[in-house]
């Protein structure tokens, strides 16, 4: 019988008492085969973290800073359940740390040196740890003691709870630095008052502070937020302009064998029976013998943290950077304006080899990081392990939802000013063999399908979006008799046609021979009835243009396109017979890397782009013998985006809407995780 006990860790007598009450009340409402609670008492949260790591306990609820400690080796814990605040309809699991300024003050984030600062309190998250952690490498050396470095960075501050004797500048704006509400500039409202009164130039608070202190929109409009990219935004645009997004209070468990499903089952049932306004005799979110025992008193309920989300992703790049800077205190030698090498994310070993060759030829401007799937690459870019990669539009959507931004677009047509003119897009098509003359768009049910990969534009999002509108369900593996759609569940009929061996079968990378445009076309040639690809795929792999044995004798005339009106047309008539226009592939990165990725990639394409004529002896960035490694092989240049610099603007309203509609069919664990952070 599986052990269905969750050992909860308590850090005080009062917590242990509440835990025992929690245990007893759960016993009274849950059947004997359901989850149960046991209580383990430890002296501190750090002791609880160690106990969970050592399998002496299973769960504890932690503030963000401790979630970071819990994640570090050797603890390796992960977030599994989040407390939420506000309403069930609009649950808030995160708050945003922001830098508020007066509208007419005219400076940016990178011009804070010499300004006057207002903090909620020394050592507090939004008011100190996050802003000072992010500014850490700009502080004057020596950076220890930290208070002295901060005092020398700003021209004056109010940092309640600081030592006014040793660091008088930190108390300059609030004599005495009192550590309670007796100090008018203490806490969130106090720090905002410090700015409002004109004592300080910037207040480090949370996003709700300004709304709680200024009910009137006209008053709020006198203030702005400083963004990390050295721009400003209105105070209600905090989701796009903050220092960090911080989880409020989170249950953590072991990463391996951590009982996360059991913990969720327990807490979900607990909130049903003992949540807000549920029971008089025991209340989960109430602490008669103290404050915030086991859970925050202000919590309204629990939400399950998506399984794909590790602590780094949950805490977010900015928060992790800030806390790591404060804890480790390491900065690059003298910070310069020069760009660091761009860490390119390569999928599996074929891309890695091409990336390595690029790295060697770039003489250190490009470094390479490997991942097995596109989603793993996106996650690595999010957390700073990698910086950039080029993505199909479907993944630009996921990357955008995860906070990444497009920087340059692949262009596929030769033109005089290629780099200045991003193209409208390419065509997504459905290709069939000419010999299968009875096959049309209207009778694809039961046929064998070939897709570039799940989540990609021409191979999945567009055809499956159109199909969904027709069949009104997501069971595409039942619609087609079998197929190859790399990235599908291994036991799905949409992996049946794939050719990868062993663990590589149906993997969404080049280890699966039917992956990508060329792979999907090969699948049609060898096994399938229809392939969903781009309009250039057939000409690029016929007429001897692809020397591989399977392709070298193919003739374009032996293939036709399916049109949405039920007719068929020759391959060259794609402009009048396609499924939709698809946005070109684009390079994505984190916002903080945008300028450097743009600069280095433009240098690199001038050295190794389409202007290189002999690829047999020279490195060519946009060539890989039809394998589309790192970039599509038909890329002519990487073009500036001009004002299309967000994923929504880049992909266009129509495509974003189409992918949004298909979201209910999404199997993307990363998309689920990212929409948890930003619904």
């Amino acid at each position: 019988v599986p052990d269905k006990t969750v050992r909860w860790c308590a850090v005080s007598e009062h917590e242990a008492t509440k835990c025992q009450s929690f245990r007893d009340h759960m016993k009274s409402v849950i059947p004997s085969d359901g989850p149960s609670v046991a209580c383990v008492k430890k002296a501190s949260y750090l002791d609880c973290i160690r106990a969970i790591a050592a399998n002496e306990a299973d769960a504890v609820t932690l503030d963000a800073g401790l979630v970071y400690d819990a994640y570090l080796a050797p603890n390796n814990l992960k977030p599994v359940v989040a407390e939420f605040y506000g309403s069930k309809e609009d649950p808030q699991t995160f708050y945003y740390a922001v830098a508020v300024v007066k509208k007419d003050s005219g400076f940016q984030m990178n011009q804070l040196r010499g300004k006057k600062s207002c903090h909620t309190g020394l050592g507090r998250s939004a008011g100190w740890n996050i802003p000072i952690g992010l500014l850490y490498c700009d502080l004057p050396e020596p950076r220890k003691p930290l208070e002295k470095a901060v005092a020398n960075f700003f021209s004056g501050s109010c940092a309640p709870c600081a030592d006014g004797t040793d660091f008088p500048q930190l108390c300059q704006l609030c004599p005495g630095c009192g550590c309670s509400t007796l100090n008018q500039y203490f806490g969130y409202s106090g720090a905002f008052k410090c700015l409002k009164d004109g004592a300080g130039d910037v207040a480090f608070v949370k996003h709700s502070t300004i709304f709680e202190n200024l009910a009137n929109k006209a008053d709020r409009d006198q203030y702005e937020l400083l963004c990390l990219d050295n721009t400003r935004k209105p105070v209600d645009e905090y989701k796009d302009c903050h220092l960090a997004q911080v989880p409020s209070h989170t249950v953590v468990a072991r990463s391996m064998g951590g009982k996360e499903d059991l913990i969720w089952e327990l807490l979900n049932q607990a909130q049903e029976h003992f949540g807000k306004d549920k029971s008089k005799e025991f209340q989960l979110f109430s602490s008669p013998h103290g404050k915030d025992l086991l859970f925050k008193d202000s919590a309204h309920g629990f939400l399950k943290v998506p399984p794909r989300m590790d602590a780094k992703m949950y805490l977010g790049y900015e928060y992790v950077t800030a806390i790591r800077n404060l804890r480790e205190g390491t900065c690059p030698e003298a910070p310069t304006d020069e760009c660091k090498p761009v860490k390119w994310c390569a999928l599996s070993h074929h891309e890695r080899l091409k990336c390595d060759e690029w790295s060697v030829n770039s003489v250190g401007k490009i470094e390479c990081v490997s991942a097995e799937t596109t989603e793993d690459c996106i996650a690595k870019i999010m957390n700073g392990e990698a910086d950039a990669m080029s993505l199909d539009g479907g993944f630009v959507y996921i990357a955008g939802k995860c906070g990444l931004v497009p920087v340059l677009a692949e262009n596929y047509n030769k033109s005089d000013n290629c780099e200045d003119t991003p193209e409208a897009g390419y065509f997504a098509i459905a290709v069939v063999k000419k010999s299968a003359s009875d096959l049309t768009w209207d009778n694809l049910k039961g046929k064998k399908s070939c897709h570039t990969a799940v989540g990609r534009t021409a191979g999945w999002n567009i055809p499956m979006g159109l199909l969904y509108n027709k069949i009104n369900h997501c069971r595409f593996d039942e619609f087609f008799s079998e197929g190859c759609a790399p990235g599908s569940k291994k036991d799905s009929s949409l992996c049946k046609l794939c050719m990868g061996s062993g663990l590589n079968l149906c993997e969404p990378n080049n280890k699966e021979g039917y992956y990508g445009y060329t792979g999907a076309f090969r699948c049609l040639v060898e096994k399938g009835d229809v392939a969903f690809v781009k309009h250039q795929t057939v000409p690029q792999n016929t007429g001897g243009k692809n020397p591989d044995p399977w392709a070298k004798n193919l003739n374009e005339k032996d293939y036709e396109l399916l049109c949405l009106d039920g007719t068929r047309k020759p391959v060259e008539e794609y402009a009048n017979c396609h499924l939709a226009r698809a946005p070109n592939h684009a390079v994505v990165t984190r916002k903080d890397k945008e300028a450097c990725v743009h600069k280095i990639l433009r240098q690199q394409q001038h050295l190794f782009g389409s202007n290189v004529t002999d690829c047999s002896g020279n490195f060519c960035l946009f060539r890989s013998e039809t394998k589309d490694l790192l970039f599509r092989d038909d890329t002519v240049c990487l073009a500036k985006l001009h004002d299309r610099n967000t994923y929504e603007k880049y992909l266009g309203e129509e495509y974003v809407k189409a992918v949004g509609n298909l979201r209910k069919c999404s199997t993307s664990s990363l998309l689920e995780a990212c929409t948890f952070r930003r619904p």
Epitope: H349, H350, E351, L353, K354, E357, V360, N361, V363, S616, G617, N618, F619, S624, E625, K627, L629
Partner: nanobody
């Protein structure tokens, strides 16, 4: 197809030196980017150092200042001079000319380097 043969490996004490060489048959050598890779037991193969046709070099951080890559186009040979060797340099070392262009997963036998006291 270009054949690449690595040699020069062996057992050496920490702090010692070795010089690996990679001999290529075929004329592609002088125009290709060349590189040394290594693979330790249970680990992924990793790029150690590379050299372009014009002689520009690039090294992984952990070997910078200790290893030197060079090539002699007249002899169709590439070298890796390894000084101040450490136990973590223990691996099978392979050379590649990238001429197979990433797709035909061909690697030579490699040469074993063991750093141990």
């Amino acid at each position: 197809e270009v054949q690449l043969v690595e040699c020069g490996g062996g057992l050496v004490q920490p702090g010692g030196s070795l010089r690996l060489s990679c001999a290529a048959s075929g004329s592609i050598f002088s125009i290709a980017t060349m590189a040394w890779y290594r693979q330790a037991p249970g680990k992924q193969r990793e790029l150690v150092a590379g050299i372009t046709r014009s002689g520009s070099t690039n090294y992984r951080d952990s070997v910078k200042g200790r290893f030197t890559i060079s090539r002699d186009n007249a002899k169709n040979t590439m070298y890796l001079q390894m000084n101040s060797l450490k136990p973590e340099d223990t691996a099978v070392y392979y050379c590649t000319d990238y001429s197979s262009r990433y797709y035909h997963d061909y690697w030579g036998q490699g040469t074993q380097v063991t750093v141990s006291s």
